[in-house]
């Protein structure tokens, strides 16, 4: 079973070095940003289209398109739910030094963990996706 | 209304220390990162150090690490500066910050002048 | 470290007239996210800094909309479509990339 397990571990290693997590870190930023936007709550003028200053932020094609292409990386993990919960992590990871308010950091886990069903699979059980709090600058 | 209140400046000479607070009210001091940012006479701002909400995480210039340090008390919704070893180059107008939650300096005190002469 | 070239450093201006401020960083400011970790800042004579512009272009609360932030990357731009004399102060583009660095300022002041 030991040897089944590093097995495991080994491919699910390599499943995460191949797998491009950007799609889905962009989707996410730009969903809780578009959420902050929509009820004009600060920094985001209420007044403003907030869709469209910026070509990220558009409401159609960049989100739906990021969407897309997440669930078509997030796929390979859906028969490896450790693998799964390791993907998610490396997406909080990577994520985690922009968000500097804790309802960001709380707003962007929640989607994060609801990510999975979105794309029509099936969740990780126990994923712990708490990171330092604040983020960390890793340069 | 969201408030912050710098103190704590004043003259001080060379190789002393200095302790800056800020208080904040009206805001939800302790969601978010909070940031020290100084502008020297004649000069432009220049951001100095920051700590993350929950106070794990602190962040610092090159000019200022090992010198200055940042840290916060949620009971008291307050941020310190303590600055040691003073510079004359440390001469400047002292603000705090508050942090957006995604990295943009939104809420700003009016600022606290340090004076480094002998 | 992150190095921001803001010009012109100092741009008179006319009253009515169009303005624009340049803000060149020595590396990209694109994160993986998407988004660019670009800001702009106002310091008016005798206040505290105020944020314009956060993310390159979106405008911050209760910003008038003759303000306008654009670029990515390297490139950012701030423009203001028409001064007016409250405009008056400098102004600063920060990154957030890398921990946060300002640019050396630009002083807008009336011709």
């Known amino acids: 079973r030991q040897q089944w397990e590093l097995q495991g571990d080994r491919r699910c290693q390599s499943q995460l070095e191949r797998a491009n997590l950007r799609p889905c870190e962009q989707h996410l930023m730009q969903k809780i940003q578009r959420d902050e936007d929509s009820y004009g709550r600060d920094p985001y003028s209420p007044s403003q289209d907030p869709y469209s200053p910026s070509p990220y932020d558009r409401r159609g094609a960049g989100s739906s398109q990021h969407q897309e292409r997440c669930c078509n990386e997030l796929n390979e993990f859906e028969n490896n739910q450790r693998c799964m919960c390791e993907a998610l992590q490396q997406i909080m990871e990577n994520q985690s030094d922009r968000l500097q308010g804790r309802q960001q950091e709380q707003q962007f886990k929640r989607e994060l963990r609801n990510l999975p069903q979105q794309c029509g699979l099936r969740a990780p059980q126990r994923c712990d996706l708490e990171v330092e709090s604040g983020g960390r600058d890793r340069y | 209304q969201v408030q912050l209140v710098e103190s704590g400046g004043g003259v001080v000479q060379p190789g002393r220390s200095l302790r800056l607070s800020c208080a904040a009210s009206?805001?939800?001091?302790?969601?978010?990162?909070m940031h020290w940012v100084r502008r020297a006479p004649g000069k432009g701002l220049e951001w100095v150090a920051a700590?993350?909400?929950?106070?794990?995480?602190?962040y610092y210039a090159d000019s200022v690490k090992g010198r200055f340090t940042i840290s916060r008390d949620s009971s008291k919704n307050t941020l310190y500066l303590q600055m040691n070893s003073l510079r004359a180059e440390d001469t400047a107008v002292y603000y705090c910050?508050?942090?957006?939650?995604?990295?943009?300096?939104?809420?700003w005190g009016q600022g606290t002048l340090v004076t480094v002469s002998s | 470290e992150i190095v921001l070239t803001q010009s012109p450093l100092s741009l008179p201006v006319t009253p009515g007239e169009p303005a624009s401020i340049s803000c060149r960083s020595s590396?990209?400011?694109?994160?993986?996210?998407?988004?660019?970790?670009l800001d702009w800042y106002l310091q008016k004579p005798g206040q505290s800094p105020q944020l314009l512009i956060y993310?390159?272009?979106k405008r911050a609360s209760g910003v008038p909309d003759r303000f306008s932030g654009s670029g990515s990357g390297t490139d950012f731009t701030l423009k203001i479509s028409r001064v007016e004399a409250e405009d008056v102060g400098v102004y600063y583009c920060?990154?957030?990339?890398?921990?946060?660095?300002f640019g050396q300022g630009t002083k807008v002041e009336i011709k």
């Open positions: 009206g805001i939800a001091f302790n969601d978010y990162t």
């Open positions: 920060m990154q957030a990339l890398q921990t946060w660095t």
């Open positions: 910050a508050r942090d957006s939650g995604y990295r943009s300096l939104l809420h």
């Open positions: 590396q990209s400011l694109v994160h993986r996210n998407g988004y660019n970790y």
């Open positions: 993310m390159a272009s």
């Open positions: 700590i993350s909400y929950g106070g794990t995480n602190k």
